[in-house]
């Protein structure tokens, strides 16, 4: 077959080819930020000629044109300046209201490099209607100016702009408009990952919150867990594998879907995941009817086995057939469970469609969506039971109208997005499911996104201050209890002056709490073995502090998961009959277990906990410490089996002031405290200028650094004695 000509350069931009110069290859243009390619793409036809999708006239030279944002068509009850036909990137538009009207939304908006306005639609409202004035987004025209219960407003976009959101909205009895705000956008515009992740995440969290009724009950935790177990989510992942998707992009689709699966399984809900790849025909790789769809590893391995070449013979984009296979799956499950049963009716369904273009065969995908809505009986009362997310990737031939038609429309939420490329998709899926926004006491959740603050990454982390100076660290293990080291409290029992500083989203300095009571392990006595020549002994170096008030859960304050509790069992996604031994075997399962602690400056530092034979050689070094242990004969007199050991090779060593802080591991996007920092042979902070300076021990140091942490698996009786009514412990 003839190849297509290579004179396809774009001035000021670059291009990529999905399958070289061969027929069927898609050429995609890209331009620097603030410019867009015209045309966006070309397809190599079997005749050896390039064709521009949607173009009627012959091939024109590809150019990078400046991005512009749409102008307001009308602005009610106020004025806007400057008045232009469209606005350049970086250009501003300002809004003011007439007397008697109050401005809601953004008074000044700036045109962003993706052709989208920042901020929110400006509305001049006098509060007269049953519903607030829904406003008119930039570039839109609205018909309907009554805002009473039952009144409808309709929107259309001016000139060649595309409408996303709801073209018709109704004022509902609760004073909220149905659907989602319509936005008029340039056909070439796309969404930035940093906008999509929170929008997608908010919507998803709403759905997961509804699936996980823990937030709605004030009953005992045992009851709470039963309720949690009754929530069920079916997640359907639809991956476009058509000709225009390159193999590399398909890999990123798969990777992004894996991230999503991984993240969704970290929620404490029951979830079944279906995987469907599609081109001209759909291929079901995992069905929700298969028991394996509830098993994260099985789902991920079926994703990994998804093969780009599976769809070699049919390379069109049949979105209808893909959605129809979801419908058929739902139909089978309904017949299996019984249409009238709670088991069927209480399942929530989320469909995520990852595509790079418009459907070009098989009929309108909207028909399949209508069938799905019908079988799930989606009406105003059951609106929460279905969410369809339509994500277009590659801004080239993506059909905004179609995506918008497929995506769900819910107030304050967005379900249809177009991203510039698969890298952006990956970023979105990395950050969208930020469980840390949940307000209940779900444990072990840290915000892992790149722009999160240190406190958001480790929201359990607290600082303990005897008077003014910080002394020790600790970890929230519930909304009122902190776990720390006993050796921090050496002034007898007067804790009236002590404070615990807990993370607070409203203040970078955190919030101070008084201590209601301190429970210090009675077994702790630093001088216990002085007569054996052991000048300091840290056995039982553990304490609990009950704060004077409960901590309000937030992105900055949330407990860590304690192993051997039901809470941790849920987070580990272990079966109900699991024991404390099972948790230890799962978490401390290697000779060298990667773990972390939090530094004085709040950053997360890495260590390796040595287990088994390696624990013995890690601890042996203590015999070289002649000042603290002048005539030590048996290392186990000092390093009992209560301690975990780290500090070999590239490990960071904790400073004295980091004592009491959690030693924790990450599993399934959740964090589990296995130890607490107790004592060590080297202090990297000693005499430093400030909290950001740490000194590595010289290689020649004798003894070399070693750090010892109280092993929480060895402190179970004491923890159970004092936290029995705070946490739900598993059998030993």
């Amino acid at each position: 077959a003839p190849s297509c000509p290579q004179n396809v350069n774009i001035s000021g931009g670059t291009f990529t080819l999905s399958h070289g110069w061969a027929p069927g290859s898609l050429l995609t243009y890209s331009c620097p930020q603030g410019l867009y390619p015209s045309p966006a793409s070309r397809l190599c036809k079997s005749s050896g000629q390039w064709q521009t999708p949607g173009a009627t006239r012959s091939l024109s030279k590809a150019v990078c044109k400046p991005v512009r944002c749409p102008a307001p068509v009308s602005f009610e009850n106020g004025i806007y300046t400057p008045r232009l036909g469209s606005y350049p990137v970086g250009g501003n538009v300002s809004f003011e209201c007439e007397d008697g009207f109050i401005l809601r939304g953004s008074p000044v908006r700036q045109c962003r490099p993706n052709g989208m306005w920042d901020g929110e639609t400006a509305v001049c409202d006098n509060g007269a209607g049953h519903c607030p004035n829904p406003g008119i987004s930039l570039g839109a025209v609205r018909t309907g100016f009554r805002f009473g219960h039952g009144d409808k407003v309709r929107y259309r976009c001016s000139s060649n702009l595309v409408l996303t959101g709801s073209s018709e909205r109704e004022c509902q009895g609760n004073g909220v408009w149905s659907g989602t705000e319509p936005i008029c956008r340039q056909p070439y515009s796309y969404d930035f990952p940093e906008d999509v992740a929170p929008a997608l995440g908010t919507s998803f969290s709403h759905m997961l919150g509804a699936t996980n009724p823990t937030q709605k009950t004030k009953e005992s935790l045992g009851r709470k867990i039963q309720i949690q177990r009754s929530g069920h989510l079916n997640l359907y992942l639809l991956l476009d594998c058509s000709q225009s998707v390159s193999e590399n992009d398909f890999l990123i689709f798969k990777e992004s879907a894996s991230l999503m699966v991984d993240r969704i399984f970290s929620f404490e809900i029951n979830v079944s995941v279906a995987i469907i790849t599609f081109a001209s025909e759909p291929k079901v790789l995992m069905s929700v009817l298969n028991d394996n769809s509830r098993d994260m590893t099985e789902v991920i391995s079926s994703l990994e086995n998804a093969n780009y070449k599976d769809h070699e013979n049919g390379t069109g984009t049949n979105t209808y057939a893909a959605l129809n296979s979801v419908y058929l799956m739902m139909n089978n499950q309904m017949r299996l469970l019984g249409m009238e049963t709670m088991a069927w009716q209480e399942i929530r369904h989320a469909i995520i469609l990852l595509t790079d273009g418009k459907s070009n065969m098989g009929g309108s995908p909207k028909t399949a969506v209508d069938h799905i809505r019908e079988i799930l009986n989606i009406n105003q009362k059951r609106n929460d039971y279905l969410d369809i997310y339509a994500i277009g990737v590659g801004k080239l031939d993506v059909d905004w109208r179609e995506l918008n038609e497929l995506g769900s429309k819910k107030d304050g939420e967005r379900h249809a997005f177009i991203l510039q490329d698969t890298k952006a998709l990956h970023q979105v899926f990395e950050h969208m499911l930020d469980v840390s926004k949940l307000t209940d006491t779900i444990c072990g959740v840290g915000n892992m996104s790149a722009n999160a603050s240190d406190q958001e990454r480790t929201p359990w982390h607290v600082t303990i201050k005897p008077k003014s100076q910080e002394t020790c660290r600790g970890a929230l293990i519930s909304d009122q209890w902190v776990l720390t080291a006993a050796h921090c409290f050496r002034d007898g029992n007067d804790h009236s002056l002590w404070r615990v500083n807990v993370g607070d989203p409203k203040s970078q300095w955190g919030k101070e709490f008084l201590i209601e009571k301190a429970v210090i392990s009675p077994g702790f006595d630093v001088f216990a073995k002085k007569n054996q020549g052991i000048l300091e002994f840290y056995g039982d170096d553990i304490a609990l502090l009950k704060l004077a008030q409960k901590v309000k859960m937030s992105t900055h304050a949330r407990p860590i998961c304690l192993p051997c509790t039901m809470e941790a069992n849920l987070a580990l996604r272990r079966p109900q009959g699991s024991t404390c031994r099972d948790h230890e075997n799962e978490l401390l399962n290697k000779q060298s277990v990667p773990a972390h602690f939090v530094a004085l400056n709040g950053s997360k530092l890495n260590i390796n906990l040595k287990m088994g034979v390696e624990w013995t050689s890690c601890a042996e070094v203590v015999s070289q410490e002649k000042t603290m242990f002048p005539n030590l004969t048996d290392v186990r007199e000092v390093v009992t089996d209560q301690f975990l050991c780290s500090g070999t090779q590239e490990d960071e060593s904790p400073c004295k002031g980091e004592s009491g802080g959690a030693v924790f591991l990450e599993r399934r996007f959740r964090f589990f405290q296995v130890g607490l920092v107790s004592w060590g042979l080297y202090n990297p902070c000693l005499g430093s200028a400030d909290k950001n300076s740490r000194k590595r021990a010289p290689r020649s140091k004798v003894p070399p650094p070693r750090d010892f942490h109280i092993n929480l698996f060895r402190m179970q009786p004491w923890l159970r004695q004092h936290l029995g009514d705070v946490l739900n412990f598993l059998p030993l």
């Epitope: 100076q469 630093v526 603290m628 004295k656 002031g657 202090n683 000693l686 005499g687 430093s688 400030d690």
Partner: nanobody, 122 residues
Amino acid sequence: QVQLQESGGGLVQPGGSLRLSCSASGHTFRSYYMGWFRQAPGKEREFVASISWTGGSTEYADSVKGRFTISRDNSKNTLYLQMNSLRAEDTAVYYCAADYSGDFLLSDLDSWGQGTLVTVSS
């Protein structure tokens, strides 16, 4: 907060010895890590030695290891620094410091003495 007062500084020949003392007022002396710092003219204040609140563990700057010994007497609320084999580069004002955590971060220390001058010269 602990109040601290150093003494024992003076002029000494290279190779000689001195013993610095630091007396602390406040009943909480026994719960503090104690340390010595020094500052030579035109230089930054630097860590010299520290001792844990128990007296069981000590740390020294590499430059003084083997020559200086830190000790404490909790019954007398006093900290000591025995300095042997003194060198010209040990000339500085010596300060004693108290720190509850034991890290002795310069930015966080709020209990310092006034300092005592040690001059090593022939």
